[in-house]
């Protein structure tokens, strides 16, 4: 089948970072500068991504690949590929659309980005408070308090919410 | 591939619980909060709670607190809502979904839902 | 609570543009997302943060949010579009969905 398509169409035969050239008896061309095809048979080249503004470039463009952006310090990735960079706040903030605001008493963020959440009522979940939660941290719960009996083992506190610098959202 | 595959569908009793599993597969599982939302025949969508897999801390709406519990399992890449004291009310397909990154919380992947019934 | 309120339906022809709104108390200074349900299928983010849409969604489909009232509009109507949309939004401690809007493509 691979070669009664290429006897039928040459442009198979063109390899990424070429295009088909119609202009040319459907001749394999090399891309031109600013441009790339990541796969073969292509009969334009795609028009390589420009990091400007608050982008930044994190991967060049080549023949074969796209560039690649992230954002430039203050500011954080959203979307597919890095297509919206968005301001960092800090922890114990959360973005609105009036900038950067401080997270209301019984709430937390301990990340640059994202929402303030409530703290977890450890008592939901048949647990008690470990450690109470401030601005920038959730609580961290415990065993339940029947468990806190003397001669009960003693626990380990688990892991922080989250740890800072990596996007649960 | 992003992918969220929950069990089966179930039917229970009035009274009785059930638990219903969300595996993940094709993301860091442990960096994204995990929610549920249900929806009754005919009804429109119902937010009742999310768990961070990090640290397993919970938040539930509040028409479900008490009755509620949203687990997960790490090492499973598995998120579970389980629901006590089941009446027939809560007849309905439960979906889990991830949260995703827009600002305002946004649930950008679901799971296939699962049919939860409840009949004496 | 917070509330948000959606119209049960609305109609459009083939070819036309739809919009289904969604009305809540100052709306304007929340991020809104939609989401589009077909029968028996789970809902699909078809836009987030009033306006941007998710790899994958047409372009036809856009969000505009402002005052009192968000705006889902969908151009260039085809009947695949016909279904439910759900408008949401986080309100301090929970998340709020709208009642639901049934999109039927005449």
């Known amino acids: 089948f691979e070669r009664t398509r290429s006897l039928q169409d040459p442009c198979s035969n063109c390899p990424a970072g070429t295009f088909c050239d119609n202009n040319r008896n459907q001749i394999c061309s090399p891309c031109p500068p600013n441009s790339f095809s990541s796969a073969g048979g292509q009969r334009t080249c795609d028009i390589c991504r420009q990091c400007k503004g608050v982008f930044r470039t994190r991967k060049e463009c080549s023949s074969t690949s796209n560039a690649e952006c992230d954002c430039t310090p203050g500011f954080h990735c959203l979307g597919a590929g890095c297509s919206m960079c968005e301001q960092d706040c800090k922890q114990g903030q959360e973005l609105t659309k009036k900038g950067c605001k401080d997270c209301c008493f019984g709430t937390f963020n301990d990340q640059k980005r994202g929402i303030c959440r409530p703290w977890t009522n450890c008592s939901l979940d048949g647990k008690s408070v470990l450690v109470n939660g401030t601005k920038e941290r959730d609580v961290v719960c415990g065993p339940s308090p029947a468990d806190l009996s003397p001669g009960a083992s003693s626990v380990t506190p688990p892991a922080p919410a989250r740890e800072p610098g990596h996007s649960p959202q | 591939q992003m992918q969220l595959v929950q069990s089966g569908a179930e039917v229970k009793k009035p009274g009785a619980s059930v638990k219903v599993s969300c595996k993940a597969s094709g993301y860091n599982f442990g960096g994204y909060y995990m929610h549920w939302v249900r929806q009754a025949p005919g009804q429109g969508l119902e937010w009742m709670g999310w768990?961070?897999?990090?640290?397993?801390?919970?938040n539930y709406a509040q028409k479900f607190q008490g009755r509620v519990t949203i687990t997960r399992d790490t090492s499973a890449s598995t998120a579970y809502m389980e629901l006590s004291s089941l009446r027939s009310e809560d007849t309905a397909v439960y979906y889990c979904?991830?949260?995703?990154?827009?600002?305002?919380?946004?649930?950008?992947?679901w799971g296939q839902g699962t049919l939860v019934t409840v009949s004496s | 609570s917070y509330e948000l309120t959606q119209p049960p339906s609305v109609s459009v022809a083939p070819g036309k543009t739809a919009r289904i709104t969604c009305g809540g108390n100052n709306i304007g200074s929340k991020s809104v997302h939609w989401y589009q349900q077909k029968p028996g299928q789970a809902p699909v983010l078809v836009i987030y943060y009033d306006s941007d849409r998710p790899s994958g969604i047409p372009e036809r489909f856009s969000g505009s949010n402002s005052g009192n009232t968000a705006t889902l509009t969908i151009s260039r109507v085809e009947a695949g579009d016909e279904a439910d949309y759900y408008c949401q939004v986080w309100d301090s401690s929970s998340v709020v969905f709208g009642g639901g809007t049934q999109l039927t493509v005449l």
């Open positions: 768990v961070n897999p990090k640290s397993g801390g919970t």
């Open positions: 979904a991830r949260e995703g990154e827009a600002v305002g919380l946004d649930l950008d992947y």
